[in-house]
Amino acid sequence: EEELQVIQPDKSVLVAAGETATLRCTATSLIPVGPIQWFRGAGPGRELIYNQKEGHFPRVTTVSDLTKRNNMDFSIRIGNITPADAGTYYCVKFRKGSPDDVEFKSGAGTELSVRAKPSAPVVSGPAARATPQHTVSFTCESHGFSPRDITLKWFKNGNELSDFQTNVDPVGESVSYSIHSTAKVVLTREDVHSQVICEVAHVTLQGDPLRGTANLSETIRVPPTLEVTQQPVRAENQVNVTCQVRKFYPQRLQLTWLENGNVSRTETASTVTENKDGTYNWMSWLLVNVSAHRDDVKLTCQVEHDGQPAVSKSHDLKVSAHPKEQGSNTAAENTGSNERNIY
């Protein structure tokens, strides 16, 4: 009779993380009598995976009943596979001996490769806000995937970005990998509603990529434009001066009126109107009693937006002449008001 051979028919097996791996092994003969053992790797550091004779191997089950006398199928299943299980597995037949069983024949080995899904991409933007025309960096990270091949794309509002750098770590082979990418995005004034998307495609995702998003509203600061105008009111000795604060984001804004350099009133933007692009408008007005003034008055609207240095716009109020209509104003825009009589 021909000598027993240990057959491992699968040179390699590919399993998704969390699933069960089946490692096939059959013997060509019942003789010699003796148990089988499964090992991961060979050499002095090989790891025992299953011993038919003794031991507790909670993740391992046998495909057939190894207690049956005529059994020649020594295939095993390993449950809840993780990337750390990757390696080459050997089915080894032992010959019954005294006091110890003796290794007799080994299968050729089955290489187990593990597919693991990448984690949901996490996109993070700069720590501080930036203004339009500036370039900001976004990072995208995803971890724990295998095999190493992965595709990462960046989009801004559905348009693919090209200015980015991606690294997959570690450089060489590993049980699982991480990807890190940095994209550069140029901000525009219209970006309050914009989104930056990082898209990761991997063989384990079956054509349904994972996406991570960042809202540019968390990143952008659109500084306001200021316009100070004056209109007459019904009473001839009163002038209404308005400061229109337009197209700013975020909402955090404080406005101070100064009369000839002296603080007249400070207020915080509260009831703002939102523009289609996500920026805000706000208007404050000051009622000035010109009859109390001998000299011209310099009115300054000073705005501190989102903790940035103040910007201001001034208007010279001529006391000698009757006020002329300068600009228009609608009631809807009168969202902030301040009345100040000068004595």
Epitope: G41, E103, S106, R148, P170, G172, S174
Partner: antibody
Amino acid sequence: QIQLVQSGPELKKPGETVKISCRASGYTFTTYGMSWVKQAPGKGLRWMGWINTYSGVSTCADDFKGRFAFSLETSATTAYLQIHNLTNEDTATYFCARDPHSYGNSPAWFPYWGQGTLVTVSA
Amino acid sequence: DIVMTQSQKFMSTTIRDRVSITCKASQNVGISVAWYQQKSGQSPKLLIYSASNRYTGVPDRFTGSGSGTDFTLTISNMQSEDLADYFCQQYSSYPLTFGSGTKLAIK
């Protein structure tokens, strides 16, 4: 295809240091351990030790502890053997040899070998 | 250290002959034995691993056998290209050790 290409022959004086390189191609370098094997002229093979190319941890056989060091340049997929304070007994051909197992935690047999680097130590 | 003894330093053979090269381990190594062929000026070439498993691409005239302490490499139909040195190697424990080699030559 898988290749291990070693640096050229070296002629050194006793007391000097030599560094031999072994550049791997055709596979992912850090999947497989790399061993170094010495063969003196007309003699047999002696396993010197190995380096885990994933972790960078090396193991030297007792006979080769002290003057011998294994290192890596992962980005260049290259393993190195450095021998300090050379003696005449170090005259030999040195082979790098790759392990068969992905993610193996110890070497076993060697399916791939470099072509060998002859180091001659002579005053 | 485990000593791998190849008692035949030289073996004379003829083409188409059957040749058996033996290797004895100083202690039980199970089946953790590999065999290599080395031709002059070349690097070793793996023939057999796990004592009896033929490596990919190795002609089937090469057969390995044995377990425990006694191992044999058999060439069933000697060819001229098989003239070379043959080494056994154990990988049961550190340090890995090789036999001193057996040189095959034509009678």
